[in-house]
Interface confidence: medium
């Protein structure tokens, strides 16, 4: 019998510095460019190698960003949120939604022991 | 995408006040705006107001009688009308900005990017 997949949702404060590249993502999502069906938020897209997120360690390709600097990004245009991203300062706080994925063992079993049974 | 939706016009008597309601969706962090056009004449600009809800401006015709305000939380702006004269019949039209976060306040239906589709307000 197979695992079912479950969803953890959790949420972060994110404090990254800006470096000399940015803050090292790339994001998609507005209420012009639908990332999710009918959900108009703001998504990471991309994490780039050696730049200030990825460095940082916590956002995730795929993670959810509520606000920045306590600023909702609840029904922006994509390049409002770009724009909101650039102006955004040196140091910026962001809150996050992670989505995990958690892979549930066979309905029944609970216990811990060897995978292979 | 992006939906401007007035609400609130109606008919009212000389004296009387009304409140004109704009829901809006799909955008943010705008300027927001209140335009007005009588039959036969062009649209003309009423009150602004910034997109922080800090700073307001109106059209001399209206000063003392009108108060633009928005709750950025329920994404609404409002016109609240009061002593209300027959020249103030017209179609009554929300707009937004169409610079993002701008610092000043426009008063020129060019900078407006958004459009409802108006409300009506007669005064009788």
């Known amino acids: 019998m197979n695992g079912r997949v479950d969803y953890l949702v959790t949420e972060e404060e994110i404090n990254l510095t800006r470096g000399p590249s940015g803050l090292g993502f790339n994001i998609v999502g507005g209420t012009d460019q639908q990332y999710v069906s009918n959900d108009s938020g703001i998504y990471v897209s991309r994490i780039k190698e050696n730049g200030a997120a990825a460095l940082d360690g916590r956002l995730q390709e795929g993670d959810k960003i509520l606000s920045v600097n306590g600023q909702d990004l609840k029904n922006l245009l994509h390049q409002d949120a770009v724009d909101l991203f650039r102006n955004a300062g040196y140091a910026v706080s962001l809150r996050v939604q992670h989505r995990l994925q958690v892979q549930n063992g066979p309905i029944g079993h609970r216990g811990e022991g060897d995978p292979s049974g | 995408q992006v939906q401007l939706v007035e609400s609130g016009g109606g008919l009212v008597q000389a004296g009387g006040s009304l409140r004109l309601s704009c829901a809006v969706s799909?955008?943010?962090?705008?300027?927001m705006g209140w335009f007005r056009q009588a039959p036969g004449k062009e649209r003309e600009f009423v009150a602004a107001?910034?997109?922080?809800?800090?700073?307001?401006v109106y059209a001399d015709a209206v000063k003392g009688r009108v108060t633009i305000s928005r709750d950025n939380a329920k994404n609404t702006v409002y016109l609240e009308m009061n002593s209300l004269k027959p020249e103030d019949t017209a179609v009554y039209y929300c707009?937004?900005?169409?610079?993002?976060?701008?610092?000043?306040?426009?008063?020129?239906?060019?900078?407006?990017?958004?459009w409802g589709q108006g409300t009506q307000v007669t005064v009788s």
């Open positions: 707009a937004a900005d169409g610079r993002f976060r701008a610092g000043e306040i426009g008063t020129s239906l060019g900078l407006y990017r958004y």
């Open positions: 799909g955008v943010s962090f705008r300027n």
């Open positions: 107001i910034s997109w922080s809800g800090d700073s307001t």
